[in-house]
């Protein structure tokens, strides 16, 4: 862009150098050249000479008019054609920008990942603004009334050391740019309610050689949270439908979960947990792939009837991908597994 330019005159923009995308814009060029009575004044946009909608207002000034200007950025400059000069003479230049006022930030969520030492807040910024937009995260103690403010783009990590004075906070995000300002809805946060347990990991799986082979999945977490509620989902790699099994977990020892699965099939397993009764889930763990052994005895296999699922499971639900084109987007067909909590953005789903 034209950040520093020695002008021999002036250039100005109406309604301003930053304006709303789609507006009509007038750019004026006024020369103040010594020893030159310009025959013509020329406008350039991004280095290309403009041909249309240019009006010579008087001897020193010209205007170019743009209907519905919709480029996010442009570099404008104007020149004069001086008699006796082979080259055009530069008068002045300006960077101009068009964009939108910010949308109100939405879907504000704050969580504390166990052991991270931070409260992480995220939100949706809405449609692109195309211009410099600041996001200010306000964190106000409901006990001391003191407010902290953090600059961010689409998320912020706030050290829990700075949240020592209180457990209850009001959090909101303010979006500000040259064209406007919007606030998100306020979020009431209790620090004890937003902790997500340390990551759960599936460490190994084995299939026994019994008459009815049984697959045991071993999984663990370093969480210090005592009451943890978990879900394990599983499916064959060729299938689009997940089954989900629920557990109350105690991570003082490695968890073992038993499954009766189709023989000679490749299965994908994932697990996620939350503090019992709380809202925020871990993201799904990395996919763990296990190949079940070949069937030893012949029998008629009916995967959706017992003993497909071990009887000690609390609930088994099915989760189906919306379409083969969108394997990342999963739709819960059974709400029971969510215990009334929304399936908030934690779907790191495998198709």
């Amino acid at each position: 862009g034209i950040t520093s330019i020695n002008c021999s005159g002036d250039m100005w923009v109406e309604p301003g150098e930053i304006f709303q995308m789609g507006m009509n814009v007038s750019i004026y060029c006024q020369e103040a050249l010594k020893h030159c009575r310009p025959r013509n004044l020329y406008f350039y946009k991004n280095g290309f000479k403009e041909e249309f909608d240019i009006t010579r207002i008087n001897r020193t000034t010209a205007r170019i008019w743009y209907k519905g200007f919709s480029e996010p950025h442009a570099y404008m400059h104007c020149t004069a054609e001086c008699p006796g000069h082979f080259q055009e003479t530069l008068i002045c230049g300006k960077d101009i920008s068009s964009g939108h006022p910010p949308d109100a930030p939405s879907n504000l969520t704050c969580v504390i990942y166990e052991y991270s030492g931070n409260m992480t807040c995220t939100w949706n910024t809405g449609k692109p603004t195309y211009i410099d937009t600041k996001y200010i995260v306000h964190v106000k103690s409901l006990e001391t009334e003191e407010e902290q403010q953090y600059l961010a783009s689409s998320y912020v990590k706030i050290s829990t050391d700075s949240l020592q004075g209180s457990r209850k906070y009001l959090v909101w995000v303010q979006a500000v740019n040259s064209l406007g300002m919007e606030n998100s809805q306020q979020l009431h946060v209790h620090l004890d309610d937003i902790v997500i347990p340390s990551a759960s990991i599936i460490s190994r799986a084995e299939t026994t050689n019994d008459t009815v082979p049984k697959t045991i999945v071993y999984w663990k977490s370093k969480t210090m949270i005592e009451k943890v509620f978990c879900e394990m989902r599983y499916k064959t790699t060729t299938n689009q439908t997940w089954s989900v099994k629920e557990f109350d977990a105690n991570f003082t020892y490695v968890q073992q979960s038993e499954f009766y699965l189709e023989p000679d099939s490749k299965y994908v397993f994932q697990v996620r947990c939350q503090e019992t009764g709380k809202r925020n889930w871990q993201p799904w763990s990395s996919p763990f792939v296990h190949q079940t052994s070949q069937e030893t005895g012949k029998r008629n296999w009916q995967p959706w009837s017992s003993p497909f699922v071990h009887q000690t499971s609390q609930t088994v639900s099915q989760v189906t991908a919306k379409s083969s084109h969108e394997p990342q987007k999963m739709e819960m067909l059974s709400a029971t597994i969510f215990r009334g909590h929304p399936a908030s953005g934690n779907h790191q789903d495998i198709g």
Epitope: E146, E147, Q149, V156, Q174, V176, M181
Partner: nanobody
């Protein structure tokens, strides 16, 4: 209550340096966002620089690369180091609580005069 007291202004030649200080009391300074704003003769308030509650700094284009904002939480003090001063930096400088935009800065001090002139 919140109290802010600026100092360190004065008369300086173009190209010179000054360090402004803002002594703060009456609130938890260590976790507060702070801003420097200025008012040139006959003009409105303009923000100069800000530092958020986590220490992230931001500067107006007109001072970027020349001014540096910093905080000493142990001393409850905000600083503005001003180098390569220009005549257009002449103004009364105020420190304020909060960040520069969207009416987020609340209370400001009495101000300190900075004059850049040859």
């Amino acid at each position: 209550q919140v109290q802010l007291q600026e100092s360190g202004g004065g008369l300086v030649q173009p190209g010179g340096s000054l360090r402004l200080t803002c002594a703060a009391s009456g609130f938890t300074f260590s976790t507060s966002a702070m801003t420097w704003v200025r008012q040139a003769p006959g003009k409105g308030l303009d923000w100069v620089s800000g530092i958020d509650s986590g220490g992230t700094t931001v500067y107006a284009d007109s001072v970027k690369g020349r001014f540096t904002i910093s905080k000493d939480n142990a001393k409850n003090t905000l600083y503005l180091q001003m180098n390569s001063l220009k005549t257009e930096d002449t103004a009364v400088y105020y420190c304020a609580t909060g960040l520069p935009w969207g009416n987020t800065w609340r209370t400001r001090g009495q101000g300190t005069q900075v004059t850049v002139s040859s």
